[in-house]
């Protein structure tokens, strides 16, 4: 009877949609790389499902993922980073669905950090600076950054600026006076590697000065 039950389970499993997506992070922990995969359907019953990656690996043919709640995760030095790996969803020894993926085309950078904004009174501008761990990396060094800022009261009115450096100047006259602004930044691979936007950095909040009525200029904070 248990045999029939297992077969039935497998037949049921084959009716489900096991679409999944993955992203890699290179040199995320020293020389270790990571690979994270998750099902696109959050309602998939993942109880007996495992992920396996085979091919384009160093010293092994295949690696199994660790399951961390709803995501599947590998941290290893064993990615060859040349050619395509086969990533499969498995029940026991049976593969339910597989994708051939080059891990250098699904790179998600680490989120930028240390975002800050400094007002320069003499220049009448704001200097935005932030940091990224990728400056120290061997592989994914070149990134495009997306700086987004908005007046705090304008919930969905974000202004975006793309830049390749980690410094941006915002002119005071382009901002509303005596207003509170929120600003954040994210990154995407821009050269040699392909992939996805990083998570957003933590937001930074700053206030623009009042307008000085006599000169028509803003007061410093």
């Amino acid at each position: 009877e248990s045999g029939y039950a297992q077969n039935g389970d497998l037949e049921d499993a084959e009716l489900d949609d096991y679409s999944f997506s993955c992203y890699s992070q290179l040199e995320v922990n020293g020389s270790q790389h990571s690979l994270t995969c998750a099902f696109e359907d959050p309602d998939v019953n993942i109880t007996n499902l495992e992920f396996e990656i085979c091919g384009a690996l160093v010293e092994v043919k295949c690696l199994n993922f660790r399951k961390l709640q709803e995501i599947y995760f590998i941290e290893t030095k064993k990615f060859l980073l040349i050619g395509k790996s086969n990533i499969c969803v498995k029940v026991g020894e049976k593969s339910l669905t597989c994708k051939k993926i080059d891990l250098t085309t699904i790179v998600k950078p680490e989120a930028p950090f240390d975002l800050s904004v400094v007002y320069r009174e003499g220049a009448n501008d704001f200097v935005v600076t932030f940091n990224t761990s990728h400056l120290q990396k061997k592989y994914v060094k070149v990134l495009m950054h997306d700086v987004a800022y908005r007046q705090e009261k304008d919930e969905n009115k974000w202004t975006h600026v793309n830049l390749s450096s980690t410094k941006l100047t915002l002119l005071q006259r382009k901002l509303q006076p005596a207003a509170m602004y929120e600003i954040k930044v994210r990154s995407i691979p821009d050269h040699y590697f392909k992939g996805f936007w990083s998570e957003w950095s933590p937001s930074y909040y700053f206030r623009t000065p009042e307008i000085n009525n006599s000169s028509g200029e803003m007061d410093p904070i």
């Epitope: 085979c54 091919g55 690996l57 160093v58 010293e59 092994v60 043919k61 060859l80 980073l81 040349i82 050619g83 395509k84 051939k100 080059d102 250098t104 085309t105 592989y139 040699y192 590697f193 392909k194």
Partner: antibody, heavy 117, light 110 residues
Framework: QVNLRESGGGLVKPGGSLRLSCAAS????????MHWVRQAPGKGLEWLSL????????YYADSVKGRFTISRDNTKNLLYLQMNSLRAEDTAVYYC??????????WGQGTLVTVSS | NFMLTQPHSVSGSPGKTVTISCTRS????????VQWYQQRPGNSPTTVIY?????PSGVPDRFSGSIDSSSNSASLTISGLVTEDEADYYC?????????FGGGTKLTVL
């Protein structure tokens, strides 16, 4: 259909240079790892070099490291092998090969390089 | 780097089965996939087996690949030999970012 065609082979004197080209068509070139492999007359296959889809990763066999340079131009669907300081033992048929879902899923027809004084 | 050692030649009669071995000199045969290439005289190589035991589309199921951990070797088996199988056969694997070919085996169909 997939087509790889090598060119640039010929007769060259020891110490000379040559640049081989491999023109690719029929597939998404900038999605594929590419290799150069050679075969000396009457001998077996010898892997020489590979380049990642983006040109970032390049690797070489010890026998050609420092003398040969692999590169690619994804805008023109071309793979190159710049060969310097050529020796008699570099005489061979040179093949380019694609690594699609697996290494060597397609090969060119080869171009003969002869190094002789 | 490791080496891959193949017999210089093997032979078999039409309809029979031959096996070509490929022994890895150091490191485990299980640590990286093995490919097999067929090269007929005057032609470029073509893949007959990839990832140890997978057949590209168009390659007849008379061709099969296997791995034997105990002998640290890979094998290419061709059953139901036909005259068109007469060719050189090369195994290939990789070590980090370096590809390694075996020396080749000449198959003669008697």
């Amino acid at each position: 259909q997939v087509n790889l065609r090598e060119s640039g082979g010929g007769l060259v004197k020891p110490g000379g240079s040559l640049r081989l080209s491999c023109a690719a068509s029929g597939f998404t070139f900038d999605d594929s790892v590419m290799h150069w492999v050679r075969q000396a007359p009457g001998k077996g296959l010898e892997w020489l070099s590979l380049v990642g889809w983006d040109g970032f990763f390049t690797y070489y066999a010890d026998s050609v490291k420092g003398r040969f340079t692999i590169s690619r131009d994804n805008t023109k669907n071309l793979l190159y092998l710049q060969m310097n300081s050529l020796r008699a033992e570099d005489t061979a048929v040179y093949y380019c090969a694609r690594q699609g879902d697996y290494m060597g899923d397609y090969w060119g027809q080869g171009t003969l390089v002869t190094v002789s004084s | 780097n490791f080496m891959l050692t193949q017999p210089h030649s093997v032979s078999g009669s039409p309809g029979k089965t031959v096996t070509i071995s490929c022994t890895r000199s150091s490191g485990s045969i299980d640590s990286s996939y093995v490919q097999w290439y067929q090269q007929r005289p005057g032609n470029s190589p073509t893949t007959v087996i990839y990832e140890d035991d997978q057949r590209p589309s168009g390659v007849p199921d008379r061709f099969s690949g296997s791995i034997d951990s105990s002998s640290n070797s890979a094998s290419l088996t061709i059953s139901g030999l036909v005259t068109e199988d007469e060719a050189d056969y090369y195994c290939q694997s990789y070590d980090f970012h370096h590809l390694v070919f075996g020396g080749g085996t000449k198959l003669t169909v008697l």
